[in-house]
Amino acid sequence: FPQDRPFEDTCHGNPSHYYDKAVRRCCYRCPMGLFPTQQCPQRPTDCRKQCEPDYYLDEADRCTACVTCSRDDLVEKTPCAWNSSRVCECRPGMFCSTSAVNSCARCFFHSVCPAGMIVKFPGTAQKNTVCEPASPGVSPACASPENCKEPSSGTIPQAKPTPVSPATSSASTMPVRGGTRLAQEAASKLTRAPDSPSSVGRPSSDPGLSPTQPCPEGSGDCRKQCEPDYYLDEAGRCTACVSCSRDDLVEKTPCAWNSSRTCECRPGMICATSATNSCARCVPYPICAAETVTKPQDMAEKDTTFEAPPLGTQPDCNPTPENGEAPASTSPTQSLLVDSQASKTLPIPTSAPVALSSTGKPVLDAG
């Protein structure tokens, strides 16, 4: 295309531009430290700062930490991106009762429909299970095993859930978590794409490089980069993604280059005190007892309310192991088990007393 030759020469004569043969046009050369937002930037506004991994560029052009979703009850919904925080949501089996910026501050277990009730609407990350009276024709053997779950003790749950007493009430802490979850996270994160860098179990082979093209020194094509576990906030600053390392938190969305990690309460818990992109305090979620029914919620993030089932309805199940399945956990976790493989060395909060469990592993007394 001979007609492109003069244009290319013009580019060469202009130090602020370069010629892109792929698109056969003159492109604006982003200043050092900024990266192009498109293949061939045309103007300075087509260039952006880049933060380090786990930080995002906020509205004020500052790199700000993405929230973390490392609490056991949170999972990552959307990753930390260059211009937005990671977003967390309650992990499967839980719903958010108290929202937080980019996360959930309070997750509770989905209610289990009691005897005589069946699931009308299954629980989601935002809404609790909605129960309704079982149809008269439903056999006592239960229409679904899901409707037979009862607390193993058969006791009526507390109207108000009790706090889980985490080691710290802050939503941005970094305690060690149980090894099982860490191992699962580590396994899942080793395959994460470069634009959603891992924050836990990362093999540390990728220091959080730009998800766009690599940038040779002096090329001017560097996008603003953040370190691992930082994201580029709206202000263009690298900001620390929140951590979800508390035992009662799970990661809802990972730390991405432009958004914080978000955390949510782990299954079986609900957020009592919200925090930005996380939850400051998780409490156990109450389970519907026999002879109660979950009242449908107008608000997506309210606690479950209970009322007596309509007259004439009979419990379909007995709260026994034969007919019902006990929930995995109906009580708050009172200690944090430190797994020896959670990190290269064991980071133990200086405020928490340490004891040794029967397995010989240190246990953080969160009480």
Partner: antibody, heavy 123, light 107 residues
Framework: QVQLVQSGSELKKPGASVKVSCKAS????????IHWVRQPPGKGLEWIGY????????DYNQNFQGRVTITADKSTSTAYMELSSLRSEDTAVYYC????????????????WGQGTTVTVSS | DIQLTQSPSFLSASVGDRVTVTCKAS??????VAWFQQKPGKAPKVLIY???YRYSGVPDRFSGSGSGTDFTLTISSLQPEDFAEYFC?????????FGGGTKVEIK
């Protein structure tokens, strides 16, 4: 073990430039960013900027923008910090530092530091 | 930029004393704060990260607490080797910033 070894002291005149080196060993150089922090005599610490040795990309504190250039040579596992248009207030100990490989997250607090390079700017 | 104000700037104490240093951030930094100890002519050494987690090998007399904007470094029983300068650092938002330092001197 991780080591960061910096170049020796420098005496410079105002308006001149200085280039301080930081040789890394004990880990894969391209895996971690290298940060530079300075400390004027009797004062606190001030973050200058960092480089990603893998990509060559760097980021600087606005206070130094235009005067500082941080580079890295992968072949020698060495990072460099060059500060130009020196003034007397640039007299300080300059440190290179690396974040920890510790805990579950990779936040930028520094577990490894070079021994420091004293840069004196005086006419 | 986030400012970190450390207090006191100077502190005279005796061996065995309980010492508390505070660090106040100009805006919320979560728990993204580290504490360093620095002795004359030496590079800083990290003591605490994530506001309350002791770094490997740091004696348990050092503890950290706080979140949001107010942070504290406590030395439960001052030892002769603890006479040094202490700095806080926020790593929540870039640019990374440090406190002005607290010099702990022998009374």
């Amino acid at each position: 073990q991780v080591q960061l070894v910096q170049s020796g002291s420098e005496l410079k005149k105002p308006g001149a430039s200085v280039k301080v080196s930081c040789k890394a060993s004990g880990y894969t150089f391209t895996t971690y960013t290298i940060h530079w922090v300075r400390q004027p005599p009797g004062k606190g610490l001030e973050w200058i900027g960092y480089i990603n040795p893998s990509s060559g990309c760097s980021d600087y504190n606005q206070n130094f923008q235009g005067r500082v250039t941080i580079t890295a040579d992968k072949s020698t596992s060495t990072a460099y910090m060059e500060l130009s248009s020196l003034r007397s207030e640039d007299t300080a100990v300059y440190y290179c530092a690396r974040r920890a490989d510790y805990g579950n997250y990779e936040y930028t607090w520094f577990a490894y530091w070079g021994q420091g390079t004293t840069v004196t700017v005086s006419s | 930029d986030i400012q970190l104000t450390q207090s006191p700037s100077f502190l005279s104490a005796s061996v065995g004393d309980r010492v508390t240093v505070t660090c106040k951030a100009s805006q919320n930094v979560g728990t993204n704060v580290a504490w360093f100890q620095q002795k004359p002519g030496k590079a800083p050494k990290v003591l605490i990260y994530s506001a309350s987690y002791r770094y490997s090998g740091v004696p348990d007399r050092f503890s950290g607490s706080g979140s949001g904007t107010d942070f504290t470094l406590t030395i439960s029983s001052l030892q002769p080797e603890d006479f040094a300068e202490y700095f806080c650092q926020q790593y929540h938002t870039y640019p990374l910033t440090f406190g002005g330092g607290t010099k702990v001197e022998i009374k």
